[in-house]
């Protein structure tokens, strides 16, 4: 079961996998959660009746019953895995740590005003895992306002020491909060010729991919598939990293596959979650459990159900055997991969789905589109809300998007004449506005949150959000869009649309079916153009047809313009003005969301 | 079932004030706008203004803004309109409707208040 | 202000004849219209919301329709029980605004 609380001055016994150095009890239990076996640990505080050694020592432990006995001992604070519960993990850890001193390899050293200044230089460093800072208190005057940057094998500290007069912290590539370029592109028949820090066994590249992007120090990977000339090669993944942080070499090789790893783009691409099926394909491993199954489905259901099971192998049954059964193999490794892959057998494997939850929500597949036509179907855009007032009677006022469980990002002139949140009432899961009756459950709003420096649309900073009373429960109707990663500036998006419940002429009335309008993007550059009057600025984005006919308008403001991109879709504009509905030569403008991810993430990760 | 308990009758002086009452109940008091409207003897139906109980916001109309004050009491579910520097105008019945889902679904039953020297 | 003109102000007509009171808006207040029935010495009663949905409870001869500025109300078959004075009114934007009322009598 799920045991989210600590136990203070309590040690577990035996079980132990590793040893890591941590700051806090709450990251060690954060690390245990990530670490591919780990179920339990025993972190020790600083503390006089301790040998400073110890301190900030995060024991990594496992047990097949799950649990192991429990020692008093003070200074000592134990606790399970997340592995164990449901809910959202993330790695992201925004503390610092006063008078603490991480060590690593201290790679760069350069001057900083401050500390936040100097953990945005490690989140941007892509080689940084966590940093040290020396205040401008700090004894030595040479060594004030010092910013180390530090890496390690692990991503964990070496060692962990009290220093006054420093802090320490991580980098925030974890919170999405890094500019360093998201690279999704596998290269096919490539090799990077660069120093390998690790390698598992893969059953194909994108995977492969996911691994580097979690392992601390690989900055990119080469994968030799399963028809690699070297048979004892085949299927393996090697995790690299250079100095320069990008591949020194390159080389034409047939049935290799190269790529980077994916840790700028983690918040809108799933990097933990292995959902695919490989089919004649058997994964060896430590075997935990052998048990009946109907279908690999199943057997993928019993392990991820199993919080030690990390990947599994079914052989579908002989004809009339065991009720049609096969049986499903539940395994497990050292690091979570298989330790080999074999093919031509007729088994069927695959992976837990248990750390899916460890990815972003938005990153999950939602159910194919209908192609054409403009009124959508249930489902078909789970992200987007109709934001109702009651003021002077019940209506639709807004659209916005679901960008987490208790957050709606819409725009900021929306909210002209709302003099409070209580009057608002946000309806998720709608595809008919005549859906929606005096008992239908809404959200309630808890808080307006417009941009600081918004005056006008046209103007810009046209970005509120909203942070509901409740939580929203994801189904299939309901879920989260991804926000786009900063290292996706230069993506160019090939499939956006805008949705909402607007008029579908100027002069008409919000329509009761949510419409669907496929629009290209186009560039600033000739956006300005179309609007000689305005200032088009990089914190916005256009879309439009040149000879109009399909576009947002008077009652979409709010809602998203979404983009798939890599099978996932991501909240790239938020509607906001344009001259008239649908014109020739006037594209829609939308609030340029990718400029806001700062913003949206200090207002909703704030204490 | 809904309903709005509106105050008795009300005589009073030019230049006085006058504080109005309208019980709410059989419904969630503090999620829907209270209007206020008036009807002089023989007259159509003119709006005075609204209040959300669970914020305390208020619309009113420009004829009324300086004279009318509408608050409300969530602890009792009770709405108030306080008209003040009252004349022969103002005699007239005021009614509390709640302003439901779509329309004004539910009216008190009126309070009839006439302004004589 | 949108003012809502309704007309005729009184009209006269027999049991079981189809009667029909329009509303003129000044501006387009989309469906955002209400139809209200009152009775003497007694408050107003809902009839009709959205320019066109009926009301719980109210009788099927009762009729809404239009947009954007014109409306009508109509009674399909006049009952005795109808006597009322009947307003309209827009819920579109404040001020909130009400026709000034049309007095129906049975000849």
């Known amino acids: 079961e799920c045991v989210t609380q600590l136990l203070k001055d309590t040690c577990f016994e035996g079980g132990d996998i590793t040893t890591v150095f941590t700051p806090s009890a709450k990251y060690c239990q954060v690390v245990c959660t990530y670490h591919p076996r780990c179920l339990l640990f025993t972190f020790t505080a600083e503390s006089p009746s301790e040998d400073p050694t110890r301190w900030f020592t995060c024991v990594l432990k496992d047990s097949v019953t799950e649990t192991l006995p429990r020692v008093n001992r003070t200074a000592a604070i134990s606790g399970y895995s997340f592995k164990q519960c449901s809910h959202q993990i993330s790695a992201c850890n925004k503390d610092i740590y006063v008078d603490l001193d991480m060590k690593g390899i201290n790679y760069n050293s350069s001057v900083a005003k401050s500390a936040q200044e100097c953990q945005e230089r490690c989140t941007d460093d892509v080689h940084c895992h966590f940093f040290t800072y020396a205040t401008r208190q700090f004894p030595s005057l040479e060594h004030r306002n010092i910013c180390l940057l530090k890496h390690t094998q692990t991503g964990t500290p070496t060692r962990i020491t009290k220093l006054d007069k420093v802090v320490s912290g991580f980098s925030l590539k974890s919170c999405a909060l890094s500019n360093l370029a998201c690279i999704r592109d596998i290269f096919p028949n490539t090799v990077f010729a660069d120093s390998n820090i690790d390698s598992v066994m893969a059953p194909d590249a994108f995977v492969c991919g996911r691994i580097c992007t979690h392992h601390p120090g690989c900055l990119f990977f080469t994968f030799f598939s399963q028809e690699w000339p070297k048979e004892s090669q085949r299927n393996l993944c090697l995790l690299k990293t250079s100095e320069s942080g990008l591949p020194s070499t390159r080389i034409k090789k047939s049935k290799a596959l190269s790529g980077f790893s994916l840790q700028s783009c983690r918040h809108s691409i799933p990097v933990f979650c292995h959902s695919s099926f490989y089919h004649d394909t058997d994964f060896l491993g430590e075997e935990l459990d052998i048990v009946a199954a109907k279908s690999h489905e199943a057997c993928q259901k019993l392990c991820t159900n199993a919080v030690r099971c990390q990947f599994f192998t079914y052989t579908p049954a002989q004809a009339s055997c065991n009720e049609g059964k096969g049986k499903c193999y539940l395994k497990l490794s050292s690091n979570g991969s298989p330790t080999k892959i074999l093919h031509g057998r007729g088994g069927i494997s695959g992976y837990t789905l248990r750390l899916c939850k460890m990815d972003n929500e938005c990153t999950t597949k939602i159910k194919p589109r209908i192609v054409g036509g403009t009124a959508s179907v249930r489902g078909e855009w789970p992200w987007q809300v109709t934001l109702h007032t009651t003021s002077p009677t019940q209506r639709h006022l807004c659209g916005g998007s679901i960008i987490g469980n208790q957050w709606i990002l819409t725009a900021a002139h929306c909210f002209y004449g709302v003099e409070s949140p209580k009057i608002l009432r946000v309806y998720s899961g709608i595809l008919n506005q005549s859906e929606i009756k005096e008992d239908t459950s809404f959200f309630g709003v808890q808080e307006i949150i417009i941009h600081d420096q918004y005056k006008m649309a046209e103007s810009g900073y046209d970005i509120a959000l909203l942070k509901l009373e409740t939580t929203v429960n994801y189904t299939d109707s309901q879920r989260p869009i991804c926000l786009p990663s900063k290292g996706d500036r230069n993506v160019i998006y090939t499939d956006c649309w805008v949705t909402g419940w607007g008029y579908r002429k100027l002069r008409d009335k919000i329509q009761n079916t949510l419409q669907k309008a496929k629009i290209p993007l186009v560039t600033n550059e000739e956006c300005q153009k179309r609007y000689r009057g305005h200032k088009i600025t990089h914190k916005m984005i256009c879309a439009g047809y040149r000879e109009g006919g399909k576009d947002a308008c008077k009652g979409d403001s709010g809602g998203p313009l979404s983009c798939k991109h890599n099978e996932v879709w991501h909240l790239v504009g938020i509607t906001s003005w344009g001259e008239g509905c649908a014109q020739r030569e006037r594209p829609g403008v939308y609030t340029n969301v990718v400029e806001y991810v700062d913003w949206i993430l200090e207002k909703t990760q704030a204490v | 079932q809904v309903q709005l308990v509106q105050s008795g009758s009300e005589l009073k002086k030019p230049g006085a004030s006058v504080k109005l009452s309208c019980k709410a109940s059989g419904y969630t008091f503090t999620r829907y706008w209270m209007h206020w409207v008036k009807q002089a003897h023989g007259q159509g139906l003119e709006w005075i203004g609204n209040?959300?109980?669970?914020?305390?916001?208020?619309n009113y109309d420009e004829k009324f803004r300086t004279r009318a004050t509408l608050t409300a009491d969530t602890s009792t579910s009770t709405a108030y309109m306080h008209l003040s520097s009252l004349t022969s105008e103002d005699s007239a019945v005021y009614y509390c409707?709640?302003?439901?889902?779509?329309?004004?679904?539910?009216w008190g039953q009126g309070t009839s208040v006439t302004v004589s020297s | 202000n949108i003012v809502m003109t309704q007309s005729p102000s009184s009209l006269s007509a027999s049991v079981g004849d189809r009667v029909t009171i329009t509303c003129k808006a000044s501006e387009n207040v989309v469906t955002y219209v209400s139809w209200f029935q009152q009775k003497p010495g007694q408050a107003p009663k809902l009839l009709i919301y959205g320019a066109s949905n009926r009301y719980t409870g109210v009788p099927d001869r009762f009729t809404g329709s239009g947009s954007a500025t014109d409306f009508t109300l109509t009674i399909s078959s006049l009952q005795a029980e109808d006597v009322a004075d009947y307003h309209c009114g827009q819920s579109y934007s404040y001020p909130l605004t009400f026709g000034q009322g049309t007095k129906l009598e049975i000849k």
């Open positions: 209040i959300y109980p669970d914020s305390d916001s208020t």
């Open positions: 409707t709640r302003m439901g889902f779509y329309a004004m679904d539910y």
